[in-house]
Interface confidence: low
């Protein structure tokens, strides 16, 4: 399987909410001994391998933000811990999973990575990740809503916070 990042760049105004999205592309084994873990973390560019460094998102580690379920099941993170930090990661039945960050500040700017691990019990795992950049802007040049740039082309798309989940 692979992980697709529909958007490689998100440009948002300060104070806005944004939902960063990844998509799990098949084939996905739905056997009873197959477990999927999905999570998010921050990283930095200029490394030997993108996303190899794992830094917290608003002080929450990738362990704190993980989703655990089999196949294409829906799941949510532990609400109390994440929501206290203005975060929520979620997953739907179609392989899409996301992290929502509320009330963005300039400190949220950076490289974000989604990670999917397929674990077949008593066998090796398969790990894949996707990367995307978030730029939070302030001042008169900042957009009024988040602008996203698709990974496959340079066309941009204007989105509002509550519509993010529909852009898959």
């Amino acid at each position: 399987f692979k992980v697709a990042t529909p958007y490689s760049l998100y440009v948002c105004p300060e104070g806005q909410n944004v939902t960063l999205t990844c998509r799990l592309l098949g084939p996905v084994d739905k056997g009873h001994d197959v477990t999927f873990y999905k999570t998010w973390y921050r990283s930095s560019r200029g490394e030997v391998q993108t996303c190899s460094e794992r830094r917290p998102i608003r002080n929450l580690t990738f362990q704190d933000l993980h989703l655990h379920h089999g196949g294409h099941q829906a799941a949510n993170t532990s609400h109390d811990l994440a929501q206290r930090h203005g975060l929520e990661s979620a997953s739907d039945h179609h392989g899409n999973f996301s992290i929502t960050m509320r009330n963005l500040t300039l400190l949220d700017s950076g490289l974000y990575c989604c990670l999917v691990v397929e674990i077949r019990h008593h066998h090796s795992e398969h790990r894949v990740h996707g990367a995307m950049e978030l730029q939070v802007q302030t001042g008169k040049d900042a957009p009024s809503n988040c602008v996203v740039y698709p990974s496959s082309s340079q066309e941009s798309e204007n989105i509002t916070a509550h519509h993010h989940h529909h852009h898959h």
């Epitope: 190899s52 794992r54 674990i119 066998h123």
Partner: antibody, heavy 121, light 108 residues
């Protein structure tokens, strides 16, 4: 700072049992996978067992499978290794090690100082 | 089981010299899931390098890792007195997780 403190080692006769403990502090224990690694006197390192962050999955080296049981109590921030049917070749310093991941294994980023287990008649 | 073979078993060098330690796997270690540890007598191992080439937090820049597939190398560019120890490679690609037998770096 992160601290892992092993205890429970000692001298035991072949065929007997022993339980090792590893008390963790300085990090969110319940978010990390953990391992036991051992080192026979004058020898190299040998991975023994691995447990997921929530205790739901456990993996063992063939040399200890069926004899050793890894477990954890997240409410007490403690990792355990129950060792049954001990053999002379189990004599080693046993290290508790934190995994950098929470389920599947990555590298071991923190280690305890170890506890010595001697199996001898 | 992936068998890791380290060479040389012992390496005798002087402070200031460059040390090159090798770790060869019996089968390919996918995604470079290989780590290096340093261990001094009476102490626990310490993580130096992960994912074959990434330095762990607090590890000096003189330590570097390279390689992929079946051949991996740990290089210490200019040896400091505190670097004389035993070094182990470890793969975390598949169960059982295995270590090399170690390379002892001693003062010449």
């Amino acid at each position: 700072q992160v601290q892992l403190v092993e205890s429970g080692g000692g001298v035991v006769q072949p065929g007997r049992s022993l339980r090792l403990s590893c008390a963790a502090s300085g990090f969110t224990f319940s978010s990390y996978a953990m391992h036991w690694v051992r080192q026979a006197p004058g020898k190299g390192l040998e991975w023994v067992a691995h447990i997921w962050y929530d205790g739901s999955n456990k993996y063992y080296a063939d040399s200890v499978k069926g004899r050793f049981t890894i477990s954890r109590d997240n409410s007490k921030n403690t990792l355990y290794l129950q060792m049954n049917s001990l053999r002379a070749e189990d004599t080693a310093v046993y290290y508790c090690a934190r995994d950098s991941g929470f389920y599947e294994s990555y590298y071991f980023d923190e280690w305890g100082q170890g506890t010595l287990v001697t199996v001898s008649s | 089981e992936i068998v890791l073979t380290q060479s040389p078993a012992t390496l005798s060098l002087s402070p200031g010299e460059r040390a090159t330690l090798s770790c060869r796997a019996s089968q390919s270690v996918s995604s470079s899931y290989l780590a290096w540890y340093q261990q001094k007598p009476g102490q626990a191992p310490r993580l130096l390098i992960y994912d074959a080439s990434n330095r762990a937090t607090g590890i000096p820049a003189r330590f570097s890792g390279s390689g992929s597939g079946t051949d991996f190398t740990l290089t210490i560019s200019s040896l400091e007195p505190e670097d004389f120890a035993t070094y182990y490679c470890q793969q975390y690609n598949s169960y059982p997780y295995t270590f090399g037998q170690g390379t002892k770096l001693e003062i010449k």
